[in-house]
Amino acid sequence: APISSHCRLDKSNFQQPYITNRTFMLAKEASLADNNTDVRLIGEKLFHGVSMSERCYLMKQVLNFTLEEVLFPQSDRFQPYMQEVVPFLARLSNRLSTCHIEGDDLHIQRNVQKLKDTVKKLGESGEIKAIGELDLLFMSLRNACI
């Protein structure tokens, strides 16, 4: 089971209208550049077999991957939203740095790895897709971690 006290974010993180709006605007703009509507990153396959109490830890993994492998490399695109949203998400990642789960997390890593593999396989269009799903990342973090 997760160490719940560390796998939590204060709901105030998700109640800031300005940065919430900027996150959704960034997702919307990137989605307009995403021509691959058949592939889903954040959805039922990601959560399959993961209990509700493990999902904040799961989303921490997705958030860290998205920051390091997608947002940082694409940081010059989708301005001015990117320069505001990346620091916000980085702060959330930092606040989840002590979020771990005890015991076997293989099933979680397997699901996250599938998402990573999909993004990598699609190359730059996979990165654009991940940015286009930042609204879902935001909602998933909020639903799982508050």
Partner: antibody, heavy 119, light 108 residues
């Protein structure tokens, strides 16, 4: 098999409250959000909100804020929706439905509970 | 604000193909789901994520997307397909699911 079974029909007076139950079976209750959706006679579907059975956390549609309360009892795998200060236009069939992520399709629905508000 | 637009009714002869559309502004990164509701019954999910079919739903039911329009296609229509059909997306900007107004499918 996976199912959601709701409580029976209710008749209420304006100003009263109603509490509808939704009993889950055939899956791990805590792993799916329970949503409430209502349908007025001859009308479309209207989302009211969800409860996270694991944490008890809720998210309500703005229209129902302050009037709706969604709860759950983990020990009996049951979710509840209470609507207060009932008006005649609250007459509807109330459905519970489950979803995996909080923003995914509703893959299983309860059979519905007719709530009639009449003086 | 987002609105999903469906035709109020569609009529089709048995054995033919029925197409029900769902239009919305800014559909692009939203997943479209379709529900069938027969009179006096609860809705049933028939298509999710634009084109995926839940187990138990006949292959005659399919979904597709083109730009800002999603389409539910029912091939070789049967009398038992007569029902109301609703499209749905999750609107992240308002953080709630949006339902179309519903389409009544009549089998002639």
């Amino acid at each position: 098999q996976v199912q959601l079974v709701q409580s029976g029909a209710e008749v209420k007076k304006p100003g009263a409250s109603v509490k509808v139950s939704c009993k889950a079976s055939g899956y791990t209750f805590s792993d799916y959000y329970i949503h409430w959706v209502r349908q007025a006679p001859g009308q479309g579907l209207e989302w009211m909100g969800w409860v996270n059975p694991d944490t008890g956390g809720t998210r309500y549609a703005q229209k129902f804020q302050g009037r709706v309360t969604m709860t759950r009892d983990m020990s009996i795998s049951t979710a509840y929706m209470e609507l207060s200060r009932l008006r005649s236009d609250d007459t509807a069939v109330y459905y519970c439905a489950r979803d995996l992520t909080g923003f995914d399709p509703f893959d299983i629905w309860g059979q519905g509970t007719l709530v009639t508000v009449s003086s | 604000s987002s609105v999903l637009t469906q035709p109020p009714s569609v009529s089709v002869a048995p054995g033919k193909t029925a197409r029900i559309t769902c239009g919305g502004n800014n559909f692009r990164n939203k997943r479209v789901h379709w529900y069938q509701q027969k009179p006096g019954q609860a809705p049933v999910l028939v298509i999710y994520y634009d084109s995926d079919r839940p187990s138990g739903i006949p292959e005659r039911f399919s979904g597709s997307r083109s730009g800002n329009t999603a389409t539910l296609t029912i091939s070789r229509v049967e009398a038992g397909d007569e029902a109301d059909y609703y499209c749905q997306v999750w609107d992240s900007s308002t953080d709630r699911p949006l339902f179309g107004g519903g389409t009544k499918l009549t089998v002639l």
